[in-house]
């Protein structure tokens, strides 16, 4: 995502003024002696190395040599204080100190930014023993330096519970600008201003920013990092990037697409999943959201009937799931259904309309003039009724359902009988004597069972009694 010009490339002479010092890599030329160890010191003897005494953290030995003169204060010799180098170069630096031979177990440790460097670092300590002192050179090398190697390095040595600390060696790894904040893709409202941010760091500093929109530079002069670009508004999609320049060259951010929010595309593939007499379950595939989340959808339903007034029923629903059960429809009717969805910008066009039908409904009225007689000789109950006046939408009558409930002395049981559509009378066997029989009848179509008639009760006496119950509902005109 990040493209980098080569370090040598300086395509745009942006930066007047003094340049940082030339690259320094090998500041110390270490003698190749056999007495070396990887971080593990060993006392040996060799001539003292000359060096300017360090006046900071100094250990002053109390021991006298030859019983008379005091030993000089112990201090690390001064070395290079600041090393500037390019990324991926190698660097080696060292600390040196001369230690009187009276001290045993001298260990030099390396520290970076206050933390001890342990483990697999390229630290080598060399010893040059002499009669009275041992010169110790601790070197630290880094191959192919990275920005993370930037920092302040010091040597520490412990002698007699005293700690001697070297001057810091500051390593500055320079390279192409490194982005800490890049512009982000956004979806924006048409002709509305918005901001983009770009931030890059060195070293070397300063880092200067150029903004690029659709391959054209927005600012012809650089802006110091961090830079905020106020885009005055867009009418169409645009691609933005920023260029970060420093003395090493330039780094280009990822290009980000800024999209313009628009009304959504209409939904597609409206499908019927299930139809009942009074409801239809539909689903749809949402169209493109116009770079703005869907808020809700609208299901539009028109009855397809030459006699209907052509009005549209509108049902609002959430944008997801992409499914809706349309209710309160008429049975056995044809409908045209379309779906539209909205985002913050507005409503989409309506999807292609699809046709759907509801199934037959159940009857809406109960059979009329229900009468119940006890036929003692046959030990059954005779039931008669009149066919209900059903609407077309209820579909074709397929029969009747008779409910008879027998109640006596705390016992109650309901039985159901089905009879064909051509019948308007039925006989049921007496189930219990000295009991009440309650009869209700409902018409049945393919769409289901209609409402039951009002209950008609008849008392079934012990043998020898006769009773007659009037009809449950008077026939029209028989008032």
């Amino acid at each position: 995502a990040i493209t980098e010009a080569r370090e040598e490339a300086k395509p745009y002479p942006l930066f007047p003024g003094p340049l940082p010092g030339s690259l320094q890599t090998d500041h110390t030329s270490l003698l190749s002696l056999p007495h070396t160890s990887g971080y593990q010191p060993a006392l040996m003897f060799s001539p003292t190395q000359p060096g300017r005494p360090y006046t900071g953290n100094v250990a002053i030995p109390r021991v006298t040599s030859a019983g008379s003169k005091l030993l000089p204060p112990l201090a690390f010799k001064h070395t290079v204080g600041h090393i500037i180098l390019s990324e991926h170069k190698d660097v080696k630096f060292n600390c040196s100190i001369s230690v009187p031979n009276i001290y045993q177990d001298t260990t030099i440790s390396w520290w970076k930014d206050g933390k001890e460097l342990l483990g697999a670092h390229h630290a080598i300590t060399q010893f040059y023993p002499d009669d009275e002192v041992t010169a110790i050179i601790a070197s630290f090398s880094i191959t192919s330096v990275q920005r993370s190697d930037n920092g302040s390095y010091i040597c520490k040595m412990k002698i007699n519970n005293e700690e001697i600390v070297s001057d810091p060696i500051y390593i500055e790894v320079q390279g192409l600008p490194h982005f800490t904040k890049q512009p982000e893709s956004m979806n924006v409202t048409r002709n509305t201003a918005f901001n983009l941010t770009c931030q890059a760091v060195g070293p070397p500093e300063p880092v200067n920013i150029f903004w690029v929109q659709n391959s054209s530079r927005v600012n012809e002069q650089p802006e110091k990092s961090p830079s905020v670009l106020t885009v005055p508004g867009l009418t169409e999609m645009a691609v933005f990037s920023c260029e970060a320049h420093n003395d090493k060259g330039l780094t280009v951010s990822k290009g980000v697409q800024i999209n313009i929010k628009a009304i959504p595309s209409p939904p597609t593939e409206v499908s019927i999943h299930n139809s009942t007499a009074h409801s239809i379950l539909i689903s749809w595939v949402p169209g493109f959201d116009g770079y703005s989340p869907f808020r809700n959808c609208s299901v539009q339903v028109k009855e397809v009937d030459p006699l209907s007034n052509g009005s549209v029923m509108i049902f609002n629903t959430s944008a997801s799931p992409h499914m809706y059960q349309i209710k309160q429809l008429q049975a056995l009717a044809n409908y045209s259904i379309g779906v539209s969805c909205m985002n913050e910008i507005g409503w989409s066009a309506v999807s292609p309309w699809i046709l759907a039908s509801t199934t037959e409904g159940a009857p809406s009225v109960a059979p009329l003039n229900v009468t119940v007689f006890l036929n003692e000789s046959r030990d059954n109950v005779d039931i008669r009724w009149m066919k209900p006046l059903t609407k077309r939408q209820a579909g074709e009558l397929v029969g009747y359902r008779i409910s008879h409930v027998w109640q006596s002395a705390g016992i109650s049981k309901e039985l159901l009988e089905e009879v064909g559509q051509n019948n308007s009378r039925a006989q049921i066997s007496v189930q219990v004597h000295n009991a009440t029989c309650t009869v209700r009848i409902a018409a049945v179509t393919k769409g289901g069972v209609g409402p039951f008639s009002d209950p008609v009760k008849i008392f079934i006496p012990a043998h020898g009694w006769v009773d007659h119950a009037p009809s449950s509902t008077p026939a029209p005109g028989n008032a």
Epitope: N191, W211, S216, V218, N219, E220, Q221, P232, G233
Partner: antibody
């Protein structure tokens, strides 16, 4: 407040050289490039090019390459337009204007009329 | 280079009238700026980046457009609006200006 103040009118003969100044105040001079725009009498505006006030690098529109030179005196926050070997068609008012984002010329000098007459 | 064609060259209007002037580009541009210039003065920044009014510009001015077609509209012209209006494109070097539309009041 930001101001661009240009030098006064110039009357020159063909073949001579003229140098117009544009002194900026009210902002950091090196933050914005400086454009030069030509307007012949009764005509429209024509962009001549610009100078990067940070680096001093000039950019010239094709019609203004050769006899025209943009320069700076950064310490004095001043930009200059020099026209060498003046011709009759150089008779015009020359404007300096700051270069903002999207090449928006937010601030203009009052203009310098250069008359070329034998 | 992109050529900007402004029309009409001269626009005559009565105070209170609504007027629109257009600027067509020979190729698509990202933004159009507009400047107002009165006789003997330097151009004044008027509309920035297609539709943003510069500081101090009355709200009766508006700008719109995209691609190759841009316009400046004055909802109710006033006497002080008499001037020449120049468009200038951003998006392709060299920067170019239109020849101007001169608004005259009847």
């Amino acid at each position: 407040q930001i101001q661009l103040v240009q030098s006064g009118p110039e009357l020159k003969k063909p073949g001579e050289t003229v140098k117009i100044s544009c002194k900026a105040s009210g902002y950091t001079f090196t933050n914005y490039g400086m454009n030069w725009v030509k307007q012949a009498p009764g005509k429209g505006l024509k962009w001549m090019g610009w100078i990067n006030t940070y680096t001093g690098e000039p950019t010239y529109a094709d019609d203004f390459k050769g006899r025209f030179a943009f320069s700076l005196e950064t310490s004095a926050s001043t930009a200059y337009l020099q026209i060498n070997n003046l011709k009759n068609e150089d008779l015009a008012t020359y404007f300096c204007a700051t270069y903002g984002h999207y090449a928006w010329f937010a601030y203009w000098g009052q203009g310098t009329l250069v008359t070329v007459s034998a | 280079q992109i050529v900007l064609s402004q029309s009409p060259a001269i626009l005559s209007a009565s105070p209170g009238e609504k007027v629109t002037m257009t600027c067509r580009a020979s190729s698509s541009v990202s933004y159009m700026h507009w400047y107002q210039q009165k006789s003997g003065s330097s151009p004044k920044p008027w509309i920035y980046a297609t539709s943003n009014l510069a500081s101090g510009v009355p709200a009766r001015f508006s700008g719109s457009g995209s691609g190759t077609s841009y316009s400046l509209t004055i909802s109710r012209v006033e006497a002080e609006d008499a001037a020449t209006y120049f468009c200038q494109q951003w998006g392709t070097k060299p920067l170019t200006f239109g020849a101007g539309t001169k608004l005259e009041l009847k």
